[in-house]
């Protein structure tokens, strides 16, 4: 029997390399049985995962699982940094892996790290 | 079941360089990382990097940074690994490997994949 | 880079007897969410290595219950209750914490 239990699809440890400047659509794929839960984005900030109250967010749903997305129109520099999903279900909070996401500055094309050479600054993340 | 099949056996010459490929079955491997790992002859195991087939995201070891490249199709299931200028001391022994993204719950390796470099 | 460490290099045990290796990281294996993401490897001579045991004690599926695994932060452990004839292979610990993921020299068991 599948478990009823609210999941939250974000892999350990996921990185995306982003650019700045343009529209970019982070993801938190939901697995729920009955009643959607309620869910939120939030921001790491050392140990605290800060709330992100005033940002565009959105539901998208597919047959088995719904994805519950934070919008990023366009995506700035200050938005580099890791991020969880959190869902709300029965009284219980269920918080996703942190997933980080580096961002570039606009640049010529030429001149764009390529997403090799982004996965080897470790420091954009501190 | 999980399970990785890596390209046959390569006879290389110095400087020459070489892809070669693992591909994934009995999974969606969009939901798993795939790694590359060394092993020299009668040596031990070293990390080489790992790949997000998901949207193509590579992590390396500091060791193999800039010699090596990984990449992924996921729309036939495959990993990649491109060695360049190929040295003597490449002669080894390449695994794949596929794990669970979310709770690590698999962690499966390919046969592996011999590459003798030789003049 | 974290540093693993195993000890012994190698291990010659009776058949029946229990086998203890042991390995040591550079520093803790706690990650921020709680879990400690240390591995044991098996590799058999002339075969591809396989996982036996992962997040410090659980065992992956079809692992003989013979086999298990201990520890905390810096300090772990594999234990091989009674010793087999197809136990003998090469053990690796390693890291799945932090990036670079490393591994330990590894520790050769024979049998006596």
């Known amino acids: 029997k599948e478990s009823c239990d609210v999941q939250l699809y974000i892999k350990r440890q996921s990185e995306h390399s982003i650019l700045a400047g343009d529209p970019f659509e982070l993801e938190c794929p939901v697995k729920y049985c009955a009643n959607r839960p309620h869910v939120t984005w939030c921001k790491l900030n050392g140990t605290t995962c800060v709330k992100l109250e005033d940002r565009q967010t959105s539901w998208k749903e597919e047959k088995n699982i719904s994805f519950f997305i934070l919008h990023f129109e366009p995506v700035l520099p200050n938005d580099n940094g890791s991020y969880r999903c959190s869902a709300n279900f029965q009284s219980n909070l269920i918080e996703s892996h942190s997933t980080t996401l580096y961002v570039t500055d606009v640049k010529s094309a030429s001149e764009r790290p390529s997403k090799d050479e982004m996965a080897s600054r470790p420091w954009l993340l501190y | 079941e999980v399970q990785l099949v890596q390209s046959g056996a390569e006879v290389k010459k110095p400087g020459e360089s070489l892809k070669i490929s693992c591909k994934g079955s009995?999974?969606?491997?969009?939901?798993?990382?795939m790694y590359w790992v060394r092993q020299m002859p009668g040596k031990g195991l070293e990390w080489i990097g790992r790949i997000d087939p998901a949207n193509g995201y590579t992590r390396y070891s500091p060791s193999f940074q800039g010699q090596v490249t990984i990449s992924a199709d996921k729309s036939i299931s495959t990993a990649y690994l491109q060695l360049s200028s190929l040295k003597a001391s490449d002669t080894a022994m390449y695994y794949c490997a596929v794990y669970d993204g979310y709770y690590e719950s698999f962690d499966v390796w390919g046969q592996g994949t011999l590459v003798t470099v030789s003049s | 880079d974290i540093v693993m460490t195993q000890s012994p290099d190698s291990l010659a045990v009776s058949l029946g007897e229990r086998a203890t290796i042991n390995c040591k990281s550079s520093q803790s294996l706690l990650d921020s969410d709680g879990k400690t993401y240390l591995n044991w490897l098996q590799q058999k001579p002339g075969q591809s290595p396989k996982r036996l045991i992962y997040?410090?004690?659980k065992l992956d599926s079809g692992v003989p219950d013979r086999f298990s695994g201990s520890g905390s932060g810096t300090d772990f452990t594999l234990t091989i209750s009674s010793v087999q004839a197809e136990d003998l292979a090469v053990y690796y610990c390693?890291?799945?914490?932090?990036?670079?993921?490393?591994f330990g020299q590894g520790t050769k068991l024979e049998i006596k």
């Open positions: 390693w890291q799945g914490t932090l990036f670079p993921r490393t």
């Open positions: 009995g999974v969606n491997i969009k939901d798993t990382y």
């Open positions: 997040l410090v004690s």
